[in-house]
Each structure stands twice: as structure tokens, then as C-alpha cells.
Interface confidence: low
């Protein structure tokens, strides 16, 4: 780990990587880009998957939070021998399969996909890629695209969530290192703190949720604050205000002293959730306090 900016968000991160014949001489640059970026997502609740595509899509490393498995996955990634066609949709299919089946404690964890390709997708392949990216989106994923060399930015803007979710690398593969910071900044959604972190039992409160990336949602009207109470009941609340670095949310009224509410955020109307280690607890407040 080389220090510098990091992301503390708890979500599922999928790398979908082009290993078609055209990247044969540039695989190392792709690998080092992924390796450096992967090390910047440091939450123990963050899971990661590596998927490669050419004439078919292959899950090189299934979703895992195990850092040793991630290290081994990176080793496997480094050994990849590129070749074949650019069937990007196959990569998205492998991601969607995992998103669909990887439920955590009965509801879905938020997913972020970073897809990298170097070429223009021709007609049908573009349609299939957009279609499969849309399927991932409908399962709650936020989709970013990195385009290197001969990519078509208009195509990638339709595969990604928007033009703002595309990272063009016009100066060739060696310039991939230069976008690590901007990708990290844009793709990181993290909950860092809640103010107040202790509330009075039986009283209504507003909570300021501090973090980053809350306006990365495709539609900020779909952002929700979620409170998982005593590891059982989950209550979703619509924020009064959504800013990039904080949310202002109504807190649920917790009637008993000692109750705990784990804070989560959904960017998509409760379809999936960013997890955190932030807990709000209740205490007894005497009259006038």
C-alpha cells in the first residue's frame, strides 16, 4: 500500500477487463492499473471481483473480502494472456450473475463496476454490451467505463451510467496510472460518521451522515438513509438534503435505551446498500438535557 487517498466504503467492486487480442502488448499496464486501484479500497466490508472478457467472459476471482484471496486474484490477473474478440457483454453477464446471487443478510449490497476496454464495439456487440450493462444497473450497480486508445466515447457513455462515468485515456495505456485518483474519487461512496452518534431514546432527531460520493447516484431523489436496528428491523428514510459529502436524514425514533442502529445508504431507492461501521446508539436523556 502506497498511502495517498483511499476509500472506506463497504460495497461490492467488480473489475471487468478487456483481454482481447488488441491489448496483448499492454496487459501489464492494465494489470498495474487494477492492482494500484484495488489497494485503495480498504474497508473490511468491501468485496472485490475480477472478470476478464475476450471471445467469452471469465470470472477470474469471485467476489471476496478476503485480502489474501484478492492478492492471489491479482497474481492470476497478471498471468492472463490476452487474445480473441471484444465481447464486453460477456463480462457484464458474469458480473450480473454474481450481483444477482450474492445477497448479504437478506438484502443486496451496493455494486460498483469498473469496465475497461480499448476498442470500438461494432453494432451488435455494442447493443449487447449496453443491454448487459443495463441489466447490471437494474440489479443496483453503478457502472463506470475506462476507455483506452481506440475507444468510442459515445458508446462508453451509454454503457456507463452517463458521460460523467467515463474515464477517457487518450494517451495510451501508460497513461492509465494518471486516472487512478479521479476514478477513486468518483467511484468511492463511503459513510464516515454520523452526527450525533448518540441520540435520546424516544425522541425524534435529524442525523447528519458524513461521507463522500452521495451525489454519484444516477438520481439523487433515489438516495435513502437506512437504519438497521439491533441487527433485525431495517427502516429507510428519505434524506431532507443530499450533498456530495453529507446527507441530512430524519432518524427513526428508537424507544429504548441501548438500542443500536447501523447506518447504511442506498443510492437506488433501497435496491442495494452501501454498508458502514457507523453505529447510532440511544441513551437516556433527563428532562431539560
Amino acid at each position: 500500500e502506497d498511502g495517498g487517498p483511499a476509500c472506506y466504503g463497504g460495497f461490492d467492486l467488480y473489475f471487468i477487463l478487456d483481454k482481447s487480442g488488441s491489448v496483448l502488448h499492454h496487459w501489464n499496464e492494465i494489470y498495474y492499473f487494477v492492482e494500484q486501484l484495488a489497494h485503495k479500497f480498504i474497508s473490511p466490508q468491501l468485496r472485490m471481483s475480477f472478470i476478464v472478457f475476450s471471445t467469452r467472459g471469465t470470472t477470474l476471482m469471485k467476489l471476496t473480502e478476503d485480502r489474501e484471496q484478492i492478492r492471489q486474484g491479482l497474481e492470476e490477473l497478471q498471468k492472463v494472456l490476452p487474445g480473441g474478440d471484444t465481447y464486453m457483454h460477456e463480462g457484464f453477464e458474469r458480473a450480473s450473475e454474481q450481483i444477482y446471487y450474492e445477497n448479504r443478510q437478506g438484502y443486496r449490497t451496493a455494486s460498483v463496476i469498473i469496465a475497461l476496454t480499448d476498442g470500438e464495439l461494432h453494432e451488435d456487440l455494442f447493443f449487447y454490451s449496453e443491454r448487459e450493462a443495463n441489466r447490471s444497473r437494474d440489479l443496483g450497480a453503478i457502472v463506470y467505463c475506462v476507455g483506452v486508445k481506440d475507444f468510442n466515447e459515445t458508446q462508453l457513455a451509454r454503457i456507463a451510467d452517463s458521460k460523467d462515468h467515463v474515464f477517457p485515456v487518450n494517451d495510451g495505456f501508460q497513461a492509465l496510472q494518471g486516472i487512478i485518483h479521479s476514478i477513486l474519487k468518483k467511484s468511492c461512496i463511503e459513510i464516515l460518521a454520523a452526527e450525533p452518534s448518540t441520540i435520546c431514546a424516544g425522541e425524534s432527531f435529524q442525523v447528519v451522515v458524513r461521507g463522500n460520493g452521495f451525489r454519484h447516484a444516477r438520481n439523487v431523489d433515489r438516495v435513502l438513509c437506512s437504519f438497521k436496528i439491533n441487527d433485525s428491523v431495517t427502516l429507510n428514510e428519505k434524506p431532507f438534503s443530499v450533498e456530495d459529502t453529507y446527507l441530512l436524514c430524519p432518524a427513526p425514533i428508537l424507544k429504548e435505551v441501548g438500542m443500536k442502529a447501523a447506518l447504511q445508504v442506498s443510492m437506488n431507492d433501497g435496491l442495494s446498500f452501501i454498508s458502514s461501521s457507523v453505529i447510532i446508539t440511544t441513551t437516556h436523556c433527563s428532562d431539560g438535557s
Partner: antibody
Framework: QVQLVQSGGGVVQPGRPLRLSCAAS????????MSWVRQAPGKGLEWVSA????????YYADSVKGRFTISRDNSKNTLYLQMNSLRAEDTAVYYC???????????????????WGQGTTVTVSS | SSELTQDPAVSVALGQTVRITCQGD??????ASWYQQKPGQAPVLVIY???NRPSGIPDRVSGSRSGNTASLTITGAQAEDEADYYC???????????FGGGTELTVL
Amino acid sequence: QVQLVQSGGGVVQPGRPLRLSCAASGFNLGSYAMSWVRQAPGKGLEWVSAISGSGGSTYYADSVKGRFTISRDNSKNTLYLQMNSLRAEDTAVYYCAKILGPGNLNYYYYYGMDVWGQGTTVTVSS
Amino acid sequence: SSELTQDPAVSVALGQTVRITCQGDSLRNSYASWYQQKPGQAPVLVIYGNNNRPSGIPDRVSGSRSGNTASLTITGAQAEDEADYYCNSRDSSGNHVVFGGGTELTVL
């Protein structure tokens, strides 16, 4: 058995309001996006409105925007359509329908509507 | 005016194959669904996501999509297939749902 049972139709004068209800059974309404579709006498189907599973996002056809409000009470497993300032051209059979797929109603991956109510007739006439 | 265009009426001889088409720019990047509606009844979903049949729909009913055209094919048409058929997708803006004008199928 998954079904939608509608109520609330009737004859109403122009400019007056009316509220339609759609009670779901056999599935958890809150897990799905829902929609209202109408059919004027002798005409085809016309999409009216849709709402996400949580109720946080709503969508309207231009012909009803500003006059109709879609809502849901997930605790009662019921969908509503509040129709204000009704016009003669709103006369139709109104259907509620369950939208296939995840409840966030992302139209990029809209599949279709798999469960429909029996329909309720709204007649706007003086 | 509808963004999805269907032929108003189509006829088919009993036991023959009929294809009902639906055209619209929005179909290039979205999925088509198809509904059967008989007089006085609510619509019934027969195809979703271009080519998927819900359970209970016979396999002589199939769907496909190519470019901006979606098709519903009934192989070996039966008397009970006589109905109105509507195609449906999201519109080209991506914010709304749109229906085709409907096709009345007559089985001769």
C-alpha cells in the same frame, strides 16, 4: 395466488376528483414497481403512471402530469391513483399492473408488466 | 401519437403461422413485451424481454427483436388466439413506458 384487485371507479363530473385503489395479494407490493394503464372505449392501451417499490420515484404520462398522483401504502399492500381535475378524455377502463423485475423501476431494463388488475371503469360526464 | 407502430389488423388461417410486428426507434435499445387482450378482459402478458414466455403461455407463442422491430409469432394459430395484441417498451427518452396501437388478430 398473485393477484391485483381494483376498486374506486364510477361516474364523476368534469373537474371533480376520484381515487382508485389496487390491493395486492400473494406478493409483497413493496418489492415491486407498479403502474397504471388505461384504455378508452374502443381504443388501445395507454400508460398513465408508474411508481418505484419504495414510492420514492414516480413517473407520469404527459397527458396526466400535474393532475394525477400515484402513491402506495406498502403496509396495506395497496396502490393508489388520485385523479384530480378530471376531463371527458380521461374516461376509460383503468388497470393497475405489477412491473417485472427489481423494484427500483429503472426503465433501462424494463421487461414488461406481468400481473394486471381486473380493471375499473371511470366515466367523466356532466 | 404512439412511438410504437403496429398493423391495425392481421388475419391467419386456423393452424397456420402468423407474425405480428411492432416498429419503433426505442426498440433498438430496450426490450419489447407483448400482451394479449380479449374483449372485456384485462391484458395478459405473453412475451417479456423480447423473447421470454411467462409460465402458462404455450410454446407456439414466441417473440424476437431485430433492430427497431419486435415480432410476435404464433405457430399453428388456434381459435382461442383471436384477440388484440399490444407491444410495449420504454420510450426513446427512457422515462416513460409506451404501448403500440394494437393489432386485432382474426383466426379464419
